[in-house]
């Protein structure tokens, strides 16, 4: 089959599928298209995954290119690293495979770049402008399990026709992801429809066993059942519905309980009434009627705008006083006509700006030039795992300067709507002291960290404390805390506790694997834990500090005014890199776990840029651990940590990741 035919095609294994979409799209458009189907741009990190991509793409024309999920921000070259400073759209830089078309060449990397795969030959990786609409894109879909393709039977009229959850229809699959449908036509004129479902004994399998084209019972017309047909011991047939549906009064068809539900915005099947209602980004359930949604006033959040804030239904906007103009981040204000100030542009332009040369910015800001961002994907941890945050922070400043931490992007406009999926919407509010320990390289001892001063109203951008956006799923109803509030005694101004409030986003299906954003912070190691989540709950985990894909509808606002707290040492195993191109391999380094008590700040060994590789070092079964790269020699490690009552909760190791630039007034990051 010609992959450049009009129709998309896919190749699936037992746990993931790659799909080729021959549609001309920019990188951002391609990324969104994959996300809307519940996947991501392809991230072929191993030779085995690359092999599957190769077989899917086949021998296409040399003139055609396909986006894969690699992107690099302006001025973020790291030519000695396997991914050269590029970051997967899942947020990390972990890889055991590269296929660059050319050896790395020195250069300033003045602009944002994205990676496309050649459709011909070796399917080499080429970098180029993210705003170019190339010929197509490769998506990747992960899932909990897959059903093997059905064996052809003697009575079949033709091969089974499969429809995947990401809407690809084909007869060519070897594996079918959980949720796929198989339609089998029999020569006798009847047919059968099967669903790849979870099995009671565990794993997934087809909703019925063969033979499909013989006998009676469920065989003719699926026993008249819309979804599943069950042949009882006495020979009669009963019908069942797949999860999220209920059997209608006729005992055969299945109905969606949300179809007639009185939800104003979003509905999820399940619960005592058969459904529950939820609200979109910028709204919350009305207290008097949970079916209705009322606007959230984001302007009540301290520091959401530098000067003026106007709330409106579903969002807000920042404004500046006369003589000032709104900066590109949509939050900060600068004197009118000041270098670097930029009028608001078309949103599409802002999302994928190819990088400007802003040479008047001071070095520390330019080195960071990132925003606090929400993590977009569906990130599930093991049930014992508390939520993890990573705070991007780069304390590489001149001696006489205080750290500069940028404001984030407000989450506006609302992200692309996703299919209806489980969504819970309580608010967790915790007031705890955040303590900061930064060990500056020039200090005589790791035990004498500087204190980052507290913020004051109307500070300059150089001295602003971040507002950090993040996302969490709600707890199951049995664990919903409503509002938790933990107060602590008053402290001096330099030790103000942070306000952490979380809104819980709409989730995608829980079968997606964790994705971590680009938290590249040049030598800064940061970890934050949120207390109070029951140890048997599996929360969504969001890592902060990257330019990343959208899709995480709600935001956590973390206002940090710091006191001191220890570094959390972690073990970081190294990863070998396979490369098809003549790139000299990076040396591997393994950082041993510190043996000191966690209460003492610990400096990890200084690593130079020439001897690093991208380790995959999960501390928990589903967590990635991107290690922070270093662009300018040793710099301090910073840990932000909120102690957790759950004794099983270990801090997540941070490994290699990439520093991102920020987009404007939007929660959709790449």
């Amino acid at each position: 089959q010609d992959p450049w035919a009009a129709e998309p095609r896919a190749a699936c294994g037992p746990s993931s599928c790659y799909a080729l979409f021959p549609r001309r799209r920019t990188f951002l458009e391609a990324w969104r298209a994959c996300r809307e189907l519940g996947g991501d741009l392809a991230t072929p990190r191993t030779p085995e995954e690359a092999q599957r991509v190769d077989s899917l793409v086949g021998a296409g024309p040399a003139s055609r290119l396909l986006w894969i999920g690699l992107q690099r921000q302006a001025r973020q070259c790291q030519l000695q690293r396997p991914l050269r400073g590029f970051t997967w759209t899942t947020g990390d830089q972990d890889t055991a495979f590269t296929n660059w078309a050319q050896p790395a060449s020195g250069g300033p990397c003045p602009a944002q770049r994205c990676v496309a795969l050649e459709a011909s030959g070796e399917h080499r990786w080429l970098e180029g402008s993210c705003t170019l609409a190339v010929d197509g894109y490769l998506c990747q879909f992960g899932f909990e399990g897959a059903c093997p393709a059905l064996q052809d039977e003697a009575g079949q009229a033709g091969p089974a026709v499969y429809t995947t959850p990401f809407h690809l229809v084909s007869t060519e699959f070897e594996w079918l992801p959980f949720g796929s449908v198989a339609a089998v036509q029999c020569q006798a004129g009847r047919g059968a429809s099967l669903l790849c479902v979870k099995q009671p004994e565990g794993g997934v399998g087809w909703s019925r066993a063969g033979p499909l084209c013989l006998g009676t019972g469920c065989s003719p017309d699926n026993g008249g059942c819309e979804h599943e047909c069950v042949e009882e011991v006495d020979g009669h047939v009963s019908c069942r519905c797949t999860e999220g549906f209920r059997l209608a009064a006729d005992g055969r068809s299945c109905e969606d309980p949300c179809a007639q539900a009185p939800c104003e915005q979003q509905c999820e099947p399940g619960g005592p009434q058969g459904y529950s209602c939820h609200c979109r980004l910028g709204f919350r359930p009305a207290e008097d009627d949970p079916h209705r949604c009322v606007d959230t006033d984001e302007c009540q959040i301290a520091g959401v705008c530098q000067q003026m804030c106007v709330n409106y239904v579903g969002g807000f906007e920042c404004y500046c006083s006369e003589g000032h103009e709104l900066e590109a981040d949509g939050i900060s204000c600068s004197p009118a006509g000041a270098m670097g100030a930029q009028a608001s542009q078309d949103l599409g332009d802002e999302l994928l700006d190819d990088g400007e040369d802003e040479e008047d910015e001071d070095e520390a800001w330019k080195a960071f030039n990132g925003g606090w961002t929400e993590m977009p994907g569906i990130l599930w941890m093991e049930p014992t795992q508390p939520p993890d945050f990573a705070l991007a922070y780069r304390p590489s400043f001149p001696e006489d300067r205080e750290p500069q931490i940028p404001y984030p992007e407000p989450t506006w406009p609302p992200p692309l709507s996703a299919p209806r999926v489980p969504y819970h919407s309580s608010v967790l509010s915790v007031t705890r002291p955040v303590v900061v320990s930064a060990t500056h390289p020039t200090l005589p001892s790791a035990h004498q960290p500087p204190v980052i001063p507290a913020t004051h109203p109307a500070l300059s951008r150089d001295h602003q404390i971040p507002v950090i956006a993040a996302n969490y799923p709600d707890l199951p109803s049995a664990y919903q805390p409503g509002i938790l509030s933990v107060s602590h005694s008053a402290q001096p101004p330099a030790h103000q506790p942070p306000m952490i409030s979380t809104k819980y986003p709409e989730l995608f299906p829980a079968h997606q694997s964790p994705m971590f954003p680009d938290t590249r912070v040049a030598g800064t190691q940061t970890t934050t834990h949120l207390p109070g989540i029951p140890p048997n709950h599996a929360p969504l985990v969001t890592t902060l500090g990257a330019q990343l894909p959208p899709q995480a509808p709600d935001a956590l606002v973390l206002r940090t005014q710091a006191t001191q707290l220890p570094i959390i040492p972690t073990a970081q195993p190294s990863l070998t890199t396979t490369s098809r191109s003549p790139v000299s391999p990076a040396h591997q380094i393994s950082v041993p776990a510190a043996t000191q008590p966690a209460a003492l700040p610990t400096l990890l060994p200084s690593q130079s840029p020439t001897n690093q590789t991208s380790p995959i070092s999960p501390t928990h079964p589903h967590s990635k651990a991107p290690q922070i790269p270093r662009e300018d020699g040793p710099s301090p490690k910073l840990a932000l940590w909120l102690p957790s009552p759950a004794p099983t909760a270990a801090p997540t190791a941070l490994g290699e990741a990439g520093l991102a630039e920020h987009s404007q007034r939007d929660d959709r990051w790449l």
């Epitope: 003045p110 944002q112 050649e118 402008s129 170019l132």
Partner: antibody, heavy 124, light 108 residues
Amino acid sequence: QVQLVQSGAEVKKPGASVKLSCKASGYTFTDYVIHWVRQTPGQRLEWMGYINPYDDDTTYNQKFKGRVTITGDTSANTAYMELNSLTSEDTAVYYCARRGNSYDGYFDYSMDYWGQGTLVTVSS
Amino acid sequence: DIQLTQSPSFLSASVGDRVTITCRASQNVGTAVAWYQQKPGKAPKLLIYSASNRYTGVPSRFSGSGSGTEFTLTISSLQSEDLATYYCQQYTNYPMYTFGQGTKLEIK
């Protein structure tokens, strides 16, 4: 070496059609897209459309409202551009140009090789 | 459609001079911009692609910069053979290419 050689100058009357050719050599014809660009007497360059000889995929500039047709003959390594319903405004030099695929590990859609151009004069 | 505006339209400079030509786009085109040199009676030749990358065989005195909406072609030390008209081109909404109106460079 890569070469694009275009057919000779044409003089046409208003309302007539013209079909220009562009013969490629020095590379695999089906590996690269061919674009047609014209340059009016005012020196303005104007993109007209392209063909991908691999599968005859074509796209045209809406300005030419169905007056332009680009075709390819892979056996002759030649691309053709036909323009109908000519008017004096169509008097121009017509270029074929190859779209690059990648340079030194970068992908890019600039035009790396151009034909020498064909002057088409439309006059009554 | 995306419009490209070059300035100046006409430029006269001496051998050895540093020459700068600007191209402004009506909307963000990222780095999907190329610069071409067209000598009298000849076809255009590619100089710079992707805003700042020098094409193979192009002398190092030619350089490009910019992203978004503002782009610059610089000739660091003008040579007599640089007499030509220079065009910028955007292709961010490929395949709909658009060109600037051109800058005619004359040697004093």
